[in-house]
Interface confidence: low
């Protein structure tokens, strides 16, 4: 057959559908490969040919659309599932093309079970909602186009294994969770389950998304340098190792980045002809404040290191602020019969 | 395996209050309703009571004005006082879970407890 | 007074099929959903169907449920004299805003 671009299997879009539930997959040809849409390519005389091979084969096959039901069909650019069934699990590709022209790309399609409490291998997107922050809400994902506008469809909210009613500071109102007031003990999967009919048909979609209640930014703070400070002086005699810690406090904030850094005579460690290591831990609360620490470490401290000036400094969104560690060589302890008869006054 | 156990006093006196306390073990008392349920001597199940972990409560109308839940998260405990107790309370008590779909998949054993001076 | 209604017994030989309804009103079954509950002599109530004619796992597919309009039924087929005991329709009411159980059925198996 004549050369076709082949855009590969795109693994970045991992679709994941609940077995017995409808799906409408779009061709991602239209979405992240070509640079226009499928109006303008159907106008253009283009066809979309849709193919699959199952778990497990190596063999490409027609997809059956004459289906009971019309259980799989597809709809300008969008392959639908009503609804899946577990076996349905494999690569799809999508291929448009003409006498001249061709272009396909493959995206896998896994089919998952749920059990009655709504635990499943599907991968959670995470919505995070601030603490004690005042009414706020989540959305239930990824219903648009599966019913008309003039469809009123059910919706009933769980969280974990429990349906959503009277709880006291979580309400449901239609596709829509509103949390009056987020505590910790929100934190937890929550679901929506939509029903709605068609062609005398009753369909139900299920979407489970992460609550993460984290750090208001009513209460965020410039970083904290909790270490080096003021009450700790690192004092070291040459050939010892010189270990200071750096342990910064950052209050969550929303795509803010965390950074710690060391400078030793205002350069970079990098820029300096000393053997300096630094390890860094993290650590987060469970309202994903975070706590980095970074020790910097001279194995074998030399006079001269001991004289230069050792920065901390950390950034986020809300501010940047730097500490300076107190460095000192050790006075060695005097020997008695030099030092101490001198000054004695002996002769 | 999640288990529910009933614990109390398995006499009260009229006039006096109920109290009962039922422990989950293997499992937490997050993401459910925990409810109360009875059985009165030689009658039908009575639905008593719900609360969630976070203190919200819903009560059977016709006992509202005598019950009290409570829930104690660290100890994976929720608890029930019935109070102004008369002779038509005595009854086996069971403590249950409800999980998905509004129905009781996992109840405690019971416990009978007598109204009687 | 129950707001299920319930027969208050039922019969059956071993081998037969057996089916007991559970008669309510559209505030409780019929915006709802029922579960059957299976009472034993001294043992803790088992929940035998959810949202109608669900069976948990370890329930033997010999009970069905099922729902039409405001009643439901639970039909119990290939009847084992272990099946004696008491069941119990349940639902959630709108109107109570609280859960309602039925009177009960005890199943003598003859």
């Known amino acids: 057959s004549e050369r076709c671009d082949d855009w590969g299997l795109d693994t970045m879009r991992q679709i994941q559908v609940f077995e017995d539930e409808p799906a409408r997959i779009k061709c991602p040809l239209f979405e992240h490969f070509l640079k226009f849409n499928y109006s303008t390519a159907h106008s253009a005389g283009l066809t979309l040919i849709w193919y699959w091979t199952r778990q497990d084969r190596d063999l490409e096959e027609p997809i059956n659309f004459r289906l009971p039901e019309n259980r799989i069909s597809k709809e300008k650019d969008v392959l639908w599932f009503r609804p899946t069934l577990l076996n349905d699990t494999g690569n799809y590709t999508c291929m448009l093309r003409n006498t001249t022209y061709c272009s396909k790309v493959a995206f896998p399609l896994e089919v998952v079970q749920k059990d009655s409490c709504f635990n499943s291998p599907m991968k959670l997107p995470v919505h995070k909602l601030y603490i004690e922050y005042g009414i706020q809400r989540i959305t239930c994902p990824n219903v648009d186009g599966y019913f008309p506008s003039s469809v009123k469809p059910t919706i009933t909210w769980y969280m974990g294994c429990y349906k959503i009613q009277n709880f006291n500071n979580v309400i449901p109102e239609g596709m829509n969770l509103s949390f009056l007031i987020a505590f910790i003990s929100n934190n937890g999967n929550y679901t929506c389950v939509v029903t709605y009919p068609e062609n005398g048909r009753t369909f139900h979609l299920t979407r489970t998304l992460t609550v993460k209640v984290v750090g208001s930014p009513k209460n965020a703070v410039p970083p904290v340098i909790h270490s080096p400070n003021d009450h700790v002086v690192y004092e070291k005699e040459p050939g010892e190792e010189l270990l200071i810690p750096c342990t910064v406090y950052f209050s969550f904030l929303m795509d803010s980045r965390n950074e710690v850094w060391w400078t030793i005579d205002g350069k970079k460690p990098d820029d300096i002809p000393i053997d300096v290591t630094i390890n860094e831990s993290i650590s987060h609360s469970r309202t994903e404040d975070e706590t980095r620490t970074q020790i910097l470490s001279i194995k074998k401290v030399t006079s001269e290191d001991l004289k230069r000036s050792y920065v901390c400094h950390a950034r986020s969104a809300k501010g940047e602020v730097a500490k300076a560690a107190t460095v000192k060589q050790k006075v060695p302890a005097p020997r008695y019969t030099v030092e101490l008869a001198c000054g004695f006054g002996a002769t | 395996q999640v288990q529910l156990q009933e614990s109390g006093p398995g006499l009260v006196k009229p006039s006096e209050t109920l109290s009962l306390t039922c422990t989950v073990s293997?499992?937490?008392?997050?993401?459910?309703?925990w409810n109360w349920i009875r059985q009165p001597p030689v009658k039908g199940l009575e639905w008593i009571g719900y609360?969630?972990?976070?203190?919200?409560?819903n009560y059977n109308p016709s006992l509202k004005s005598r019950v009290t839940m409570s829930v104690d998260t660290s100890k994976n405990q929720f608890s029930l006082k019935l109070s102004s107790v008369t002779a038509a309370d005595t009854a086996v008590y069971y403590c249950?879970?409800?999980?998905?779909?509004?129905?009781?998949?996992?109840w405690g054993q019971g416990t009978l407890v007598t109204v009687s001076s | 007074q129950s707001v299920l209604t319930q027969p208050p017994s039922a019969s059956g030989t071993p081998g037969q099929r057996v089916t007991i309804s559970c008669s309510g009103s559209s505030s409780n079954i019929g915006s709802n959903t029922v579960n059957w509950y299976q009472l034993l002599p001294g043992t803790a109530p088992k929940l035998l169907i959810y949202s109608n004619y669900q069976r948990p796992s370890g329930v033997p597919d010999r009970f069905s449920g099922s729902k039409s309009g405001t009643s439901a039924s639970l039909a119990i087929s290939g009847l084992q004299s272990e099946d004696e005991a008491d069941y119990y329709c349940?639902?959630?009411?709108?109107?109570?805003?609280?859960?309602?159980f039925g009177g009960g059925t005890k199943l003598t198996v003859l």
């Open positions: 293997g499992g937490s008392v997050f993401s459910y309703f």
């Open positions: 609360i969630d972990h976070s203190g919200g409560t």
């Open positions: 349940a639902a959630w009411d709108d109107s109570l805003n609280g859960r309602v």
């Open positions: 249950a879970r409800e999980g998905l779909h509004d129905a009781f998949d996992i």
